[in-house]
């Protein structure tokens, strides 16, 4: 007991790595190696004890001259061997760093998903706010102002673009006003923005049977039926998402008019589809 | 005031066309759409399908479609209807009204068509 | 095609009552609607366009209400020159259609 390889023979098969070292040799727990570490480090004495395990009290490995430490030089050439069930090869809390690491990456996961994750745009058509009549006598020709008012509400944990509004107004199914706002507003996380944009719209040729209605005078209120379509384009990350709302809306052509906000949507009135 | 003559009564032949006319006065002709009506004998009443003179859009009931056909006459404010292959399912009055919004406001006084041989 | 359902199809009244007649649309027509009087050997007569709306030379006590599906023709104090035949037509999506009719007849 006690002797220890200054030197192995190089194999190249691990099975018979060790052929030649007794049994004796490998209970001392201390192997000569000639493969280094990786990093090559060289630095000064280890201050870690090499501890002889005989199955009675351990003893000051010899190896080490008995000062318990290893001489400067020979950390890369020696080896220890130890049982596997020593509890020094499984720290208590390696399961516990394991698992907090795991956590905490699911946590940061989970939150750069849930912050990150796209939600809707909500774009709700609120109604007609105003509309603005006039006429061409001799061309039986109305024309008409409606200003329309659209609730866009945010729903992410970040901005986004409102980058433009585009809106047409269909009278019995044939368009008679469009109209386009660009580069609208930016909207914050969580946020609501009200919008209101106007589309002119004229009332004219194949329908100017509609100004004998609109400029009757019997007739108190002149309410017509428009179908009013709206496209939001949002973006967002650079990414780009179209909404798109549409209502039929009932609108005076008789007379200038402010809505409550609303309130238009529930005149009584009609949509001839000529 | 505003009028809409129709032309007057046909006694045709089954299988034969006939070409009945309502000839508008009173107002700008090309303003308002002209409907065509069916009433068989103590029937309600059928729509046939309408004519703008404006430009000259024609829309038909698809039950009437193959077996009407609306023509104008722009020079002397008349649309035409037209029937085709008659039977006797098709005697009845057929009249021609004024498109207003939300109603009909002004009728011809009616073309009685009758099928038999 | 949109379906108008008129009701009664008859009516027997006397003259200087009340009386209403009912037409439902199997869709929203959005008021687009008339109400019509014929009388015998004649050709219907606009009474109300746009569902509430007096035609010219429409005496007072014609009145229509209704809105969405649901729309009424109201007579009031009728008179002997009111008895006939009188339809609903909508006027909202092609074809247009009419009601049934209902006959309004002297007790």
């Known amino acids: 007991m006690g002797k220890s390889l200054s030197h192995l023979p190089l194999h190249s098969s691990k099975e018979d790595a060790y052929d030649g070292v007794t049994s004796e040799n490998m209970r001392n727990g201390l192997v000569n190696s000639e493969v280094h570490n990786e990093d090559g480090r060289n630095g000064d004495v280890s201050q870690f004890p090499y501890v002889e395990f005989t199955g009675r009290d351990s003893v000051t490995c010899p190896t080490c001259q008995g000062t318990g430490r290893i001489p400067r030089g020979q950390e890369n050439q020696l080896v220890a061997l130890i049982p596997y069930s020593d509890q020094r090869l499984r720290p208590r809390r390696t399961k516990l760093y394991v698992m907090a690491s795991v956590f905490v990456c699911l946590l940061l996961s989970g939150l750069a998903v849930f912050f990150l994750f796209p939600r809707s745009i909500d774009v709700k058509y609120i109604g007609v706010k105003s509309a603005y009549v006039s006429y061409d006598v001799q061309k039986r020709t109305i024309y008409l102002n409606i200003t329309n008012t659209l609730n866009i509400t945010n729903n992410n944990y970040y901005s986004v673009e409102v980058e433009n509004i585009t809106a047409q107004v269909q009278f019995s199914k044939t368009v008679i006003g469009k109209a386009r706002l660009n580069n609208i507003t930016i909207i914050g996380p969580l946020d609501m923005k009200q919008i209101d944009y106007t589309v002119p719209t004229v009332i004219a040729e194949e329908m100017s049977y509609m100004y004998d209605f609109c400029t009757l005078i019997s007739i108190k209120v002149h309410n017509i039926v428009l179908m009013m379509q709206v496209t939001v384009t949002t973006t967002y990350f650079g990414h780009s998402e179209q909404i798109s709302q549409e209502r039929y809306q009932y609108v005076d052509c008789g007379r200038n008019t402010t809505y409550q906000l609303g309130q238009s949507e529930y005149l009584n009135v009609l949509q001839p589809q000529q | 005031q505003v009028q809409l003559q129709q032309s007057g009564a046909e006694l045709v032949k089954p299988g034969a066309s006939v070409k009945m006319s309502c000839k508008a006065s009173?107002?700008?002709?090309?303003?308002?759409?002209i409907e065509w009506m069916k009433q068989s004998h103590g029937k309600g009443l059928e729509w046939i399908g309408n004519?703008?003179?404006?430009?000259?859009?024609?829309k038909y009931n698809e039950k009437f479609k193959g077996k009407a056909t609306l023509t104008v006459d722009k020079s002397s404010s008349t649309v035409y209807l037209d029937l085709s292959r008659l039977t006797s399912d098709d005697s009845a009055v057929y009249y021609c009204?004024?498109?207003?919004?939300?109603?009909?406001?002004?009728w011809g006084q009616g073309t009685s068509v009758t099928v038999s041989s | 095609d949109i379906q108008m359902t008129q009701s009664p199809a008859s009516l027997s009244v006397s003259v200087g009552e009340t009386v209403t007649i009912t037409c439902r649309a199997s869709?929203?027509?959005?008021?687009?609607l008339g109400w019509y009087q014929q009388k015998q050997g004649e050709s219907p007569q606009l009474l109300v366009f746009a569902a509430t709306n007096l035609a010219d030379g429409v005496p007072s006590r014609f009145s229509g209400s209704g809105s969405g599906t649901q729309y009424s023709l109201k007579i009031n104090s009728l008179q002997s020159e009111d008895f006939g035949t009188y339809y609903c037509q909508h006027l909202w999506s092609i074809p247009w259609t009419f009601g049934g009719g209902t006959r309004l007849e002297i007790k």
């Open positions: 009204a004024r498109y207003f919004y939300g109603g009909m406001d002004y």
């Open positions: 004519f703008h003179p404006y430009n000259d859009d024609t």
């Open positions: 009173g107002y700008t002709f090309t303003t308002f759409p």
């Open positions: 869709e929203n027509i959005y008021s687009s």
